[in-house]
């Protein structure tokens, strides 16, 4: 089965930088997964911003703002890669990534 | 001294348009997410319109959806409120007011620095 | 959307009195997301109390809020006579809009 890292627990960035978070897949290759990321505001529900599919494709929720969220994978390192863009205060959250495994 | 400055009121018939700017000063206007509050004469705050510090994300009042438009220019330290289709419930003093923005405590929120407002009246 | 209904809609008190002004949301706001305001005539607003308990820059302290879900309290220990103003309670929740309370009137007995 496959499982999931997120080896960064915390990221700080000044204001309008960039963030790169990295979700780490073991047990299983990545490249015939899904990686899904998700945010949770703090006292809101999680919410799906993006996701990556086994053949590349990409999927991003209706209603986020565009530009805002890139997600990527590196097959060498087994890792997908959300950027966010611009960094807001509105973009504060706590982000997780999840698999699918086809 | 942090100070918001609103224009761009005036009088103006239903179906006209209106262009509110807000000025900023003393602070960095580009680290702020900004609103738009109104109040109709007589009446509560009605919170208008959003938008984030890179202009990301903008929500609006169901009331404006569709007719008015929020923009800023960090360069020029500026919040405009475009207002098309203007109807005679439009009519009310509309002020820009800045988010607290991102200290330690960022979970927080709430309008800190209000502008005086400036008037809009839609009548024929 | 979330509605917030303030109570009283009018409190009469005289200076040095206790006023404790309430404000309920239709569904659970967290704490971080609510926020209270003052507001004079023919003044703007001002910020008094930001996630729910914190008080805002120069607010004095016998101004304090509380509360959590969906009942918040806004209580003022001593009234001063410059605290008679109308008050508006405010949240942002999950997502717009920004709704405020339709104000309490705090008025001299």
């Known amino acids: 089965a496959g499982h999931l890292e997120q080896p960064q627990i915390s990221s700080t960035k000044t204001l309008s930088k960039t963030a790169r978070l990295e979700c780490v897949v073991s047990g299983i290759t990545i490249s015939a997964t899904s990686v899904y990321w998700y945010r949770e505001r703090p006292g809101e529900v999680i919410q799906f911003l993006v996701s990556i599919s086994y053949d590349g494709t990409v999927r991003k929720e209706s209603g986020i703002p565009s530009g805002k969220f890139e997600v990527d994978r590196i097959p060498e390192t087994s890792t997908s890669t959300l950027t966010i863009h611009n960094v807001e205060k509105q973009d504060i959250a706590t982000y997780y990534c999840a698999l699918w495994e086809v | 001294e942090v100070q918001l400055v609103e224009s761009g009121g005036g009088l103006v018939k239903p179906g006209g348009s209106l262009r509110l700017s807000c000025s900023a000063s003393?602070?960095?206007?580009?680290?702020?997410?900004m609103n738009w509050v109104r109040q109709a004469p007589g009446k509560g705050l009605e919170w208008v319109s959003s938008?984030?510090?890179?202009?990301?994300?903008?929500y609006y009042a169901d009331s404006v959806k569709g007719r008015f438009t929020i923009s800023r220019d960090n360069a020029k330290n500026s919040l405009y409120l475009q207002m098309n289709s203007l109807r005679a419930e439009d009519t009310a003093v509309y002020h820009c007011?800045?988010?607290?923005?991102?200290?330690?405590?960022?979970?927080?929120?709430?309008?800190?620095?209000w502008g005086q407002g400036t008037t809009v009246t839609v009548s024929s | 959307d979330i509605v917030m209904t303030q109570s009283p809609g009018t409190l009469s008190l005289s200076p040095g009195d206790r006023a404790t002004l309430s404000c309920r949301a239709s569904?659970?706001?967290?704490?971080?997301?609510l926020a209270w305001y003052q507001q004079k005539p023919g003044q703007s607003p001002r910020l008094l109390i930001y996630?729910?308990?914190s008080r805002a820059t120069g607010i004095p302290d016998r101004f304090s809020g509380s509360g959590s879900g969906t009942d918040f309290t806004l209580t003022i220990s001593r009234l001063e006579p410059e605290d008679f103003a109308v008050y508006y309670c405010?949240?942002?929740?999950?997502?717009?809009?920004?709704?405020f309370g339709q104000g309490t009137k705090v008025e001299i007995k």
């Open positions: 007011a800045r988010d607290v923005g991102v200290t330690t405590d960022y979970y927080y929120y709430g309008m800190d620095v």
């Open positions: 003393g602070f960095t206007f580009s680290n702020y997410d």
């Open positions: 938008i984030s510090s890179s202009s990301s994300y903008i």
């Open positions: 569904q659970s706001v967290a704490s971080s997301y």
């Open positions: 996630g729910a308990s």
């Open positions: 405010q949240q942002y929740g999950s997502s717009p809009p920004y709704t």
